[in-house]
Interface confidence: medium
């Protein structure tokens, strides 16, 4: 998707995105909060597809690891935090039941604020 | 996922999340930039699964539609912007070929900054 830096923009929080295979992921948390195993391959009409995910998280090497960029520090403490979303994946639960479940994956790095009280 | 407001936190940008069905979505953009049709149902071993997605975008009714919360306005102009990620979906392209493709969906609302010049 279009790069904000190209438009002379900066993000409040620096993020890093990567493709993650089910083999790398191994397990995930489903919508009920249970841990499930992410299957490496998905059966499709013509065989099998490798299961993988596009994940985005806060960049631990970025400039914003100490706090968000551009925040009014007189009023706010800030923190860049990885947020998650849900995607469907073929998984196996603790009872060995295989099925399509929504699992949580990292999708963004956003800034959260807490007000500075009683400096 | 855990609600920042519960921890006395505020987001720099207000977002809204919803489940979107393929029927509502109809089309999407794939990784090559082409428009594809999102199929309503996915064949699985026991029949068919309704295809739907968890989407997050900037809240047009939120307090941050005029700019991000908590920004140092002396130095920065700011804007809350919906960002996208990729998820796999069963789709049909313009040549009626059906297949699993990664499509773009809205997954977050982040703050972008541009420096204030000549103040």
């Amino acid at each position: 998707h279009s790069d904000p830096a190209r438009r002379g923009e900066l993000s409040v929080c620096d993020s890093i995105s990567e493709w993650v295979t089910a083999a790398d992921k191994k397990t995930a948390v489903d919508m009920s909060g249970g841990t499930v195993t992410v299957l490496e391959k998905v059966p499709v009409s013509k065989g099998q597809l490798k299961q993988y995910f596009y994940e985005t998280k806060c960049n631990p090497m970025g400039y914003t690891k100490e706090g968000c960029r551009g925040i009014d520090k007189r009023h706010w403490n800030s923190q860049c935090r990885t947020t998650q979303s849900y995607v469907r994946a073929l998984t196996m639960d603790s009872k060995k039941r295989i099925g399509w479940r929504f699992i949580r994956i990292d999708t963004s790095c956003v800034c959260t604020l807490t007000i500075k009280r009683g400096r | 996922h855990s609600d920042p407001a519960r921890r006395g936190e505020l987001s720099v940008c207000d977002s809204i999340s919803e489940w979107v069905t393929a029927a509502d979505k109809k089309t999407a953009v794939d990784m090559s930039g082409g428009t594809v049709t999102v199929l309503e149902k996915v064949p699985v071993s026991k029949g068919q699964l309704k295809q739907y997605f968890y989407e997050t975008k900037c809240n047009p009714m939120g307090y941050t539609k005029e700019g991000c919360r908590g920004i140092d306005k002396r130095h920065w102009n700011s804007q809350c912007r919906t960002t996208q990620s990729y998820v796999r979906a069963l789709t049909m392209d313009s040549k009626k070929r059906i297949g699993w493709r990664f499509i773009r969906i809205d997954t977050s609302c982040v703050c972008t900054l541009t420096i204030k010049r000549g103040r």
């Epitope: 009014d72 007000i115 | 919360r69």
Partner: antibody, heavy 118, light 109 residues
Framework: EVQLLESGGDLVQPGGSLKLSCAAS????????MSWVRQAPGKGLEWVSA????????YYADSVKGRFTISRDNSKNTLYLQMNSLRAEDTAVYYC???????????WGQGTTVTVSS | EIVLTQSPATLSVSPGDRATLSCRAS???????LAWYQQKPGQAPRLLIY???TRATDIPDRFSGSGSGTDFTLTTSSLEPEDFAVYYC??????????FGGGTKVEIK
């Protein structure tokens, strides 16, 4: 010319409510934090409340916390002070002040008088 | 909360004389985050000095500020008739709350 013009002061009974307004002109309102300061008859200055440029950060003196609410409408270049559960000791001239970035008050309005009495 | 104590409460001086006003803080006001205001009867306060020693726009150079830490001074080198007023100090280092001193009234002797 940079100007602040308060309005809304009145005679009100104890326990009553009042909303003060401060119209700003001559500067970029949404670039500046704003404050309310009051002065009881024959007394000194007392800081009441302050708000950040976007209105998301708000601060109050202990004497008004829970009773007064500061807010702003940047589209109207206006600062507000909603005063509830008013007491006799809230009787004062209320000044609106523009805050410099470091929180001294570089521009003041002419003040509006609030009298709380039965 | 930082408490500011101004002295004297009233200062009687003649026009042309030097006036020295004191503002003492209950704890360190770092970075010289102290301001002085002048208020004439029936008028709003006016900023004179910020940063302990920097004159605000259009303030005559007969007004000067000094000090650091807990002790600050406002000096008027030669009082003009329009300088008779009440003067307040304010700290903006440790807030909330922003705090003012009780004021010093400069009156004609």
């Amino acid at each position: 010319e940079v100007q602040l013009l308060e309005s809304g002061g009145d005679l009100v009974q104890p326990g009553g409510s009042l909303k003060l307004s401060c119209a700003a002109s001559g500067f970029t309102f949404d670039d500046h934090d704003m404050s309310w300061v009051r002065q009881a008859p024959g007394k000194g200055l007392e800081w009441v409340s302050a708000t950040s440029t976007d209105g998301y950060a708000t601060y109050y003196a202990d004497s008004v916390k829970g009773r007064f609410t500061i807010s702003r409408d940047n589209s109207k270049n206006t600062l507000y002070l909603q005063m509830n559960s008013l007491r006799a000791e809230d009787t004062a001239v209320y000044y609106c002040a523009k805050l410099d970035y470091y929180y001294y008050m570089d521009v003041w309005g002419q003040g509006t008088t609030v009298t709380v009495s039965s | 909360e930082i408490v500011l104590t101004q002295s004297p409460a009233t200062l009687s001086v003649s026009p042309g004389d030097r006036a020295t006003l004191s503002c003492r803080a209950s704890q360190n006001v770092r970075s010289s985050k102290l301001a002085w205001y002048q208020q004439k009867p029936g008028q709003a306060p006016r900023l004179l000095i910020y940063g302990a020693s920097t004159r605000a726009t259009d303030i005559p150079d007969r007004f000067s500020g000094s000090g650091s830490g807990t002790d600050f001074t406002l000096t008027t080198s030669s009082l003009e008739p329009e300088d008779f007023a009440v003067y307040y100090c304010q700290q903006y280092y440790d807030w909330p709350p922003l705090t003012f001193g009780g004021g010093t009234k400069v009156e004609i002797k």
